[in-house]
């Protein structure tokens, strides 16, 4: 909501999760792994990489089925704590200028830092208008104090807020699982909020920094390297 059409393939780590329709976003973090939101879990997912217009075949797409879908063991569907999911692709993505991985964070998100949020979610705060072309939004990371004041009792240490307390610009339904990137690092995953782009109700995002070890351990545990002697 309140964003702009991204320059074509300018967000090369952005993926669309498809189950016959686009239902969530995600981020490519290696040639065979995607990170998304825990609440985006489905038993069958097709990962669509290199997308810009999700309704048109433009020639840069790679459609790869999910081989493994691993939700965080402490995901809580009521509170959306630990709202993170890993998808192993059935075959590695072909990395190129339009499809490439985003780095995991080396430090937690800092208040005031500019970030890029992207997705194919609803662009209206009231009503529905789902875009075909990838939308981008530049937004600042808010302080934890501002975040907690916006959602008293709802914000855990695994969440942070990004956006504008005055409203008007925000992620929305269909953006879940997608990236929040600051300084070339995946800091957040689109998670939840009360409505979209409402005053004093900024978007809430999963704090990826808290899950770097889990991500690395999970990838290692699910990568089968065969050693020949």
């Amino acid at each position: 909501v309140g964003g702009y059409i991204c320059e074509e393939n300018s967000v090369p780590y952005q993926v669309s999760l498809n189950s016959g329709y686009h239902f969530c976003g995600g981020s490519l973090i290696s040639e065979q792994w995607v990170v998304s939101a825990g609440h985006c879990y489905k038993s069958r997912i097709q990962v669509r990489l290199g997308e810009h217009n999700i309704e048109v075949l433009e020639g840069n797409e790679q459609f790869i089925n999910a081989a493994k879908i691993i939700r965080h063991p402490k995901y809580n569907s009521r509170t959306l704590d630990n709202d993170i999911l890993l998808i192993k692709l059935s075959s590695p993505a072909v990395i190129n200028s339009r499809v490439s991985a985003i780095s995991l964070p080396t430090a937690p998100p800092a208040a005031g830092t500019e970030s890029l949020i992207s997705g194919w979610g609803n662009t209206l705060s009231s009503g529905a208008d789902y875009p075909d072309e990838l939308q981008c939004l530049d937004a600042p990371v808010l302080s934890q104090a501002e975040c907690e004041a916006s959602y008293p009792g709802k914000i855990t240490n695994n969440m942070f807020c990004v956006g504008f307390l005055e409203g008007g610009k925000d992620s929305c339904q269909g953006d879940a699982g997608g990236p929040v990137v600051s300084n070339g690092e995946l800091q957040g995953i689109v998670s939840w909020g009360y409505g979209c782009a409402q005053k004093n109700r900024p978007g809430v995002y999963t704090k990826v920094y808290n899950y770097v070890d889990w991500i690395k351990d999970t990838i290692a545990a699910n990568s089968h390297h065969h050693h020949h002697h």
Epitope: G20, Y21, H22, F23, C24, A37, H39, C40, Y41, K42, S43, S77, R78, L80, D83, G121, A128, D129, Y130, S171, C172, Q173, G174, D175, A176, G177, V190, S191, W192, G193, C196, G203
Partner: antibody
């Protein structure tokens, strides 16, 4: 395989209540929602309400507000629909149906991919 | 509430015919529409979801199209087992609403 199995037919008197059960199997119950739909004899489909199996959030059809309650028991993967103050025009086949969970900022889509076999409820004095 | 208007209410056709059923929403629902088939005494069965996606196991002679307010279900070559009642359903928002149904009968 994925299936929803409903409780048996009921005959009730006007003013009474009925509680229909819907037991799910073949999938993780809390990853989906359940809708309830009814069909009066010779009529079309009427949506009654929806319940999230993971959060127990509900949304009821306006005309049934105050008379209907939908619940779930995650320990037995069972959904329930209770309808009170029954009238003769509540005579219908009642269906439960599985739909996508709608949580957070995922795309909200309220289709129904798996249906129970139906429970006939007859209200007659 | 979003009203769903289906037409025709009934259609007589022969095996092998192409049958088209339309559904109109009273306001825009993007692609959030489903189509169901129901046979007498049976529960509805999902055919098409998100306006044009074919449900697993459903024959490819069924197809759906449309976006916004106008949607179509097409059966390219009617088979004996396709004689049934078809319903559209808006899957965009609460309250969920169905079309009135289209009965496909043998000519």
């Amino acid at each position: 395989q994925v299936q929803l199995v409903q409780s048996g037919a009921e005959v009730k008197k006007p003013g009474a209540s009925v509680k229909v059960s819907c037991k799910a199997s073949g999938y993780t119950f809390t990853d989906y929602a359940i809708s309830w739909v009814r069909q009066a004899p010779g009529q079309g489909l009427e949506w009654m309400g929806w319940i999230s199996a993971s959060t127990a959030d509900t949304n009821y059809a306006q005309k049934l507000q105050g008379r209907v309650t939908m619940t779930t028991d995650t320990s037995t993967s069972t959904a329930y629909m209770e309808l009170r103050s029954l009238r003769s025009d509540d005579t219908a086949v009642y269906y439960c149906a599985r739909g996508d969970e709608v949580v957070g900022k995922m795309t909200y889509y309220y289709g129904m991919d798996v249906w129970g076999q139906g429970t006939t409820v007859t209200v007659s004095s | 509430d979003i009203q769903m208007t289906q037409s025709p209410s009934s259609v007589s056709a022969s095996v092998g015919d192409r049958v088209t059923i339309t559904c109109r929403a009273s306001q825009g629902i993007s692609r959030w529409l489903a189509w169901y088939q129901q046979k007498p005494g049976k529960a509805p069965k999902l055919l098409i979801y998100a306006a044009s996606s074919l449900q697993s196991g459903v024959p490819s002679r069924f197809s759906g199209s449309g976006s916004g307010t106008d949607f179509t279900l097409t059966i390219s070559s009617l088979q004996p087992e396709d004689f049934a009642t078809y319903y559209c359903q808006q899957a965009n928002s609460f309250p969920i609403t169905f079309g009135g149904g289209t009965k496909v009968e043998i000519k």
